[in-house]
């Protein structure tokens, strides 16, 4: 016959059925079956089936009355073209019926990778996503979701083009990739954590440096009124959003930040978008940036902070080396430190007089005197961006009589 | 056969929460995301969210966040919906949908009325 | 959000006349969805990605359009297919639907 041939799919290890439309009163002679290769099967009414094909023993079925062909647990070898030729009773053309069968393998969870991310002085970004799935051939059709009209698809859809700003909300991109027998869709990504890097465009931006201390609040002020174009602000730590503040109440990203009092920590202030954070901890340091976001335009405004958290500094505590004599001269070197001041804390002594000489980021005193002279008792305070702290050592008699003359 | 079988009508008071269930067949349950749809009284089809059953991934449309909340049993191929808080305003039929980028099969829905 | 405007909201048609239902989006879509609900059912895909017919749909079911503006025909209105029909977009989330359009048989 001339018409193209019936086109049939399956799917690996599965089974198919080649249909033939014989109705139940037609009279058969026989049905001869031919494979990609030869001559399969033969079949005659009340008789039982002749496989002629090794392969497909056990595999091959022909039904009654219709004498569709069945192939179970099919293989990538049985695709290709199937012909039923059809006698019937005390008719002399032999009709044919033609098919071809596809098999196709059931795909696996395609999986999404990011193959490139371009920063653009405008802090909007070009995010290139690929979508594959593991052993699939090339009758595999990808399509995304959400299918955004200024997204670009290419090698087939497995390819994704997306440009956005810090502004634009995280979306979760789904990748589906469909055979003629399965479909399957990947995890959702999220695209939003690689385009909240103001640095990778241009260097890293200096902006205001606030000083926090730690355990209480800061506010890092942004200083500036919303109007009824501005959309939202998107305030980011590193990399990672931490608040998109959309004209009302801040919804903190549930993606990265904890639930419960964690989320209630870091706020934005109804009036004019600053950060707050309550209870600083020492991990809060670093930098911060404000994404001003309107509505008039894609590009946003972006304001720049360092968040620096000191220790409030408790009160240091002095210790004296022992005492060393010579020639009437007493020597002792007094030193002033803070439990866990960090490494940002300076020491000033009092009084200074050419007898008292600091040393070592001053926190060291070297005194030196004569026997028996009086000395003055010597206060030390230490100092950092949020604190000072003081403590006075008593000199009384450290060096008063012969007993002392030795180390 | 493919399937979505949702559970039946539910009358509850407003404050309450619901649990609405939606059984998958004929298909392999993790490979598709599953949708919940809202449809109040006369009115047309909104969206609430999915729920991706091979991970337990979600995502909420802005107006359902503190009022759904999506699960999925893997091992009986079933996606719930929990709504919490109800009023008479969530008096609707709800559907769960198969799909990402257009819904291709549709539960019966769950009619939800709210009353005290 | 995406909002789409289907219409009319309600209309009428005599068996093997022509129907047109519109759908128009606030802002630019890549595809468009649309479904058929009857009263007491869920809605049924009838075609996706714009064009394409989903499996079972009648040939006389066609859809079409680009950008922001985009049609469901029927080439020949039949007793079955009074019902209320939606178009639907996921170009971004949410995925929204429009009103629906309420198809009656004259």
């Known amino acids: 016959k001339d018409s193209a041939p019936t086109v049939v799919s399956g799917i690996l290890g599965g089974s198919v059925t080649l249909p033939l439309n014989i109705s139940v009163d037609t009279e058969i002679e026989n049905v001869i079956w031919i494979g990609p290769k030869n001559a399969l099967a033969f079949a005659r009414p009340k008789e039982n089936v002749t496989i002629m094909v090794k392969s497909y023993l056990g595999r091959l079925d022909i039904t009654k009355w219709s004498y569709s062909l069945c192939i179970s647990n099919l293989t990538l070898n049985d695709a290709g073209s199937y012909k039923a030729q059809i006698n019937q009773r005390n008719f002399e053309v032999t009709t044919e019926e033609e098919f071809t069968l596809f098999v196709y393998e059931q795909l696996q969870e395609p999986q999404v990778t990011m193959k490139s991310v371009k920063v653009s002085e405008n802090f909007s970004c070009n995010i290139t996503l690929m979508c594959s799935v593991k052993g699939a051939e090339k009758s595999v059709l990808y399509s995304w979701t959400p299918r955004e009209p200024h997204a670009s698809e290419s090698n087939g859809g497995s390819i994704l083009t997306v440009s956005r700003t810090p502004c634009d909300p995280d979306l979760p991109y789904i990748c589906t990739a469909q055979n003629p027998v399965s479909q399957r869709s990947s995890l959702p990504v999220h695209v939003g954590q690689f385009c909240t890097d103001p640095g990778a465009s241009r260097g890293t931006a200096a902006g205001k440096t606030v000083v926090g201390i730690l355990g209480e609040p800061v506010t890092l002020p942004l200083e500036f009124r919303a109007t009824r174009a501005t959309k939202n602000v998107v305030w980011v730590f590193n990399t990672s959003v931490i608040s998109q503040e959309r004209r009302g109440a801040a919804t903190a990203d549930s993606r990265r930040k904890p639930k419960g009092s964690e989320e209630r920590r870091v706020r934005t202030s109804d009036q004019d978008q600053s950060l707050k954070i309550s209870q600083l901890k020492m991990e809060d340091a670093g930098p911060y940036h404000a994404y001003v976001c309107s509505e008039a335009s894609r590009d946003p405004s972006v304001r720049h902070f360092t968040l620096l958290v000191y220790k409030r500094l408790e009160k240091p505590s002095v210790t004296k080396s022992p005492v060393h004599m010579m020639n009437g001269i007493c020597e002792v070197v007094l030193t002033c430190s803070v439990d866990g001041g960090g490494n940002n804390v300076t020491y000033t002594w009092m009084p200074l007089q050419n007898k008292a000489v600091m040393s070592q980021g001053k926190s060291h005193l070297n005194v030196s005197w004569e026997s028996g002279e009086h000395l003055p008792n010597f206060t030390c305070t230490a100092h950092n961006p949020v604190s000072n702290s003081s403590s006075q050592f008593s000199s009384g008699t450290i060096c008063s009589g012969p007993e002392r003359n030795k180390r | 056969q493919m399937q979505l079988q949702e559970s039946g009508p539910e009358l509850v008071k407003p404050g309450a929460s619901v649990k609405i269930s939606c059984k998958a067949s004929g298909y392999t349950f993790t490979h598709y995301y599953i949708n919940w749809v809202q449809q109040r009284p006369g009115q047309g089809l909104e969206w609430i969210g999915w729920?991706?059953?091979?991970?337990?991934?979600?995502y909420y449309s802005e107006k359902f966040k503190a009022k759904a909340t999506l699960t999925v049993d893997k091992s009986s191929s079933t996606a719930y919906m929990l709504l919490s808080s109800l009023t008479s305003e969530d008096s609707a039929v709800y559907f769960c949908?198969?799909?990402?980028?257009?819904?291709?099969?549709w539960g019966q829905g769950t009619t939800l009325t709210v009353s005290s | 959000q995406i909002v789409l405007t289907q219409s009319p909201a309600i209309m009428s048609a005599s068996p093997g006349e022509k129907v047109t239902v519109t759908c128009s989006a606030s802002?630019?879509?890549?595809?468009m969805f649309w479904y058929q609900q009857k009263p007491g059912f869920s809605p049924r895909l009838l075609i996706y990605?714009?064009?394409n017919l989903a499996s079972g749909v009648p040939v006389r079911f066609s859809g079409s359009g680009s950008g922001t503006s985009y049609s469901l025909t029927i080439s020949r209105m039949e007793a079955e297919d009074a019902a209320t029909y939606y178009c639907q977009q996921w170009s971004s989330y949410p995925p929204t639907f429009g009103g629906g359009t309420k198809l009656e048989i004259k």
């Open positions: 802002s630019s879509v890549s595809y």
């Open positions: 990605d714009t064009s």
């Open positions: 949908a198969r799909g990402t980028g257009f819904f291709d099969y």
């Open positions: 729920i991706f059953p091979e991970s337990g991934s979600t």
